[in-house]
Amino acid sequence: QGGTRSPRCDCAGDFHKKIGLFCCRGCPAGHYLKAPCTEPCGNSTCLVCPQDTFLAWENHHNSECARCQACDEQASQVALENCSAVADTRCGCKPGWFVECQVSQCVSSSPFYCQPCLDCGALHRHTRLLCSRRDTDCGTCLPGFYEHGDGCVSCPTSTLGSCPERCAAVCGWRQMF
């Protein structure tokens, strides 16, 4: 039998690609190419990715799997999903923390660190938007507190306390007791 090269693979199914001498069926996700097929339209020898490595896509050429990423503890990252043979570790922030991107044009693969979310309650403010992808958005002061400078100040508990205009507007009803 002779061998001639054709620019495309005339094999049943569409997952064949030329690897060396022959058109070969590739390796499924989670497997690497140990050896190409040894005959036209044959199956390549594929092996499962070793522990702590992965390949996310079907492939014809990867002779080794990619190393799983380790979440950056220094940046307070945690693993949201552990690495598997077909998917890399998914790193993120633990509950109560949010992602702060380290570059201006932020995409999913950009480096990031985790910041603790603002606790609106501790600031005596309403929580307007819960913290997830960005920091908590705090609203107006909680009942019994009034805006003073950048913070919320507790209404005075007696008439002895000085009560400026904004205080009076919020806490005025308390002066009657």
């Epitope: 061998g3 030329k18 060396g20 001498l21 040894t38 005959e39 044959g42």
Partner: antibody, heavy 116, light 107 residues
Framework: EVQLVESGGGSVQPGGSLRLSCAAS????????MSWIRQAPGKGLEWVSY????????YYADSVKGRFTISRDNAKNSLYLQMNSLRAEDTAVYYC?????????WGQGTLVTVSS | DIVMTQSPSSLSASVGDRVTITCQAS??????LSWYQQKPGKAPKLLIN???NLETGVPSRFSGSGSGTDFTFTISSLQPEDIATYYC?????????FGQGTRLEIK
Amino acid sequence: EVQLVESGGGSVQPGGSLRLSCAASGFTFSSYGMSWIRQAPGKGLEWVSYISSSGGHTYYADSVKGRFTISRDNAKNSLYLQMNSLRAEDTAVYYCARYSGAFDHWGQGTLVTVSS
Amino acid sequence: DIVMTQSPSSLSASVGDRVTITCQASQDITNYLSWYQQKPGKAPKLLINDASNLETGVPSRFSGSGSGTDFTFTISSLQPEDIATYYCQQYDTLPITFGQGTRLEIK
């Protein structure tokens, strides 16, 4: 460790026959295509023949087509080259080699001398 | 058949020199090219596959590049143990063909 060991070489008269063997170890022989490659004294390398992992597909250089037959026995981890109607120009060291895209492992070779 | 034209056929260089060998295919072989080293009385040894992939255990002073029809093999700093004959080989199309070899000597 991958090992390929050729045997069966020797001197033969023109028109004679020889059968070369290649014993493989250290890898899953039945997963790999195998080839015979030769080198005439003081010359370069010349591919001779190829056989698929199952033995179902065989290929030959024009210079040996119809005279040489490649075969394999996966149960015995062995590759063979039956050489008939030998000519003086077939004199060479014959290597068996494992196909892994390129030829990543070679035997030490066996010398075939065709002379009257 | 694809003809592999290797040059030079021989070359002499000093230890520490940068050495370059070229290989030209008579038709496009994408990157299905390998380079072998053969020392006298020994079997060839695969150094590079797929034009540029260094085999495991091969010193990093060896490298390969190119695609299509033109390929280059380089030794960045020649060592005494590199004295050998070097062959390119295409495995894009049967019959498999080799270059005629480059004999490397130390000055």
